[in-house]
């Protein structure tokens, strides 16, 4: 494994509590826009300030939403995803797909640029 | 190093047209909402047009059937094509980038944005 990146991926359940401006973050993906090869799932591109995500700390930019208050988020138009989110209601529990760069052995940084590696 | 470069404004008889412009580098559109905003003097920033990461347009009332939003990801550039031009569109006019979409609001909400350009004037008089 010398000198070799390789990917640690977890997942986590993440309850989120609607705050005034929001869930506060944003994403790409979908059926009709993917952000990954050969992937249409929803990632989260951007965590605002502030804002609900940021505060509770566990969602991080990169990380790929599985579910939506159970709801599978596979094979969903962009804006269909945008519109499930923004219908979650006030408590909002998240499915998410962390993926973690390691690299001979321990666990490094998260990994820049596009989640495709 | 993100930017945003406006250009294209200028001054514009009541009734007249003009295309402004907003040209990105340091990343490319594809993913990113782009939106048009504009400030009048002693007014707040206000949206006016924006176009999301998925290519959807959309248009503030005062504006719909006037101005047409338009993206070439090719030249990583945004267009904002003005007619009809009323003395009250006079303002500076800014353009805003966005990484993917808000899962809070649509794109015409300030708020959302967290790259902006320098603004050019358009002045209908």
């Known amino acids: 494994m010398n000198g070799r990146v390789d990917y640690l991926v977890t997942e986590e359940e993440i309850n989120l509590t609607r705050g005034p401006s929001g869930l506060g973050f944003n994403i790409v993906g979908g059926t009709d826009q993917q952000y990954v090869s050969n992937d249409s799932g929803i990632y989260v591109s951007r965590i605002k300030e502030n804002g609900a995500a940021a505060l509770d700390g566990r969602l991080q930019e990169g990380d790929k939403i599985l579910s939506v208050n159970g709801q599978d988020l596979k094979n969903l138009l962009h804006q269909d995803a945008v519109d499930l989110f923004r219908n979650a209601g006030y408590a909002v529990s998240l499915r998410v797909q962390h993926r973690l760069q390691v690299q001979n052995g321990p666990i490094g940084h998260r990994g820049e640029g596009d989640p495709s590696g | 190093e993100v930017q945003l470069v406006e250009s294209g404004g200028g001054l514009v008889q009541p009734g007249g047209s003009v295309r402004v412009s907003c040209v990105s580098s340091?990343?490319?559109?594809?993913?990113?909402?782009i939106g048009w905003f504009r400030q009048a003097p002693g007014k707040e920033r206000e949206g006016v047009s924006c176009?999301?990461?998925?290519?959807?347009?959309y248009y503030v009332d005062s504006v719909k059937g006037r101005f047409t939003i338009s993206r070439d990801n090719a030249k990583n550039t945004v267009y904002l094509q003005m007619n009809s031009l009323k003395p009250e569109d006079t303002a500076v006019y800014y353009c805003?980038?966005?990484?993917?979409?808000?899962?809070?609001?649509?794109?015409?909400?300030?708020?959302?944005?967290?790259?902006w350009g320098q603004g050019t004037q358009v002045t209908v008089s």
């Open positions: 176009i999301d990461s998925v290519g959807r347009a």
């Open positions: 340091g990343f490319i559109l594809d993913y990113y909402a």
């Open positions: 805003a980038a966005d990484f993917g979409s808000s899962v809070d609001s649509t794109c015409l909400n300030n708020q959302q944005y967290n790259y």
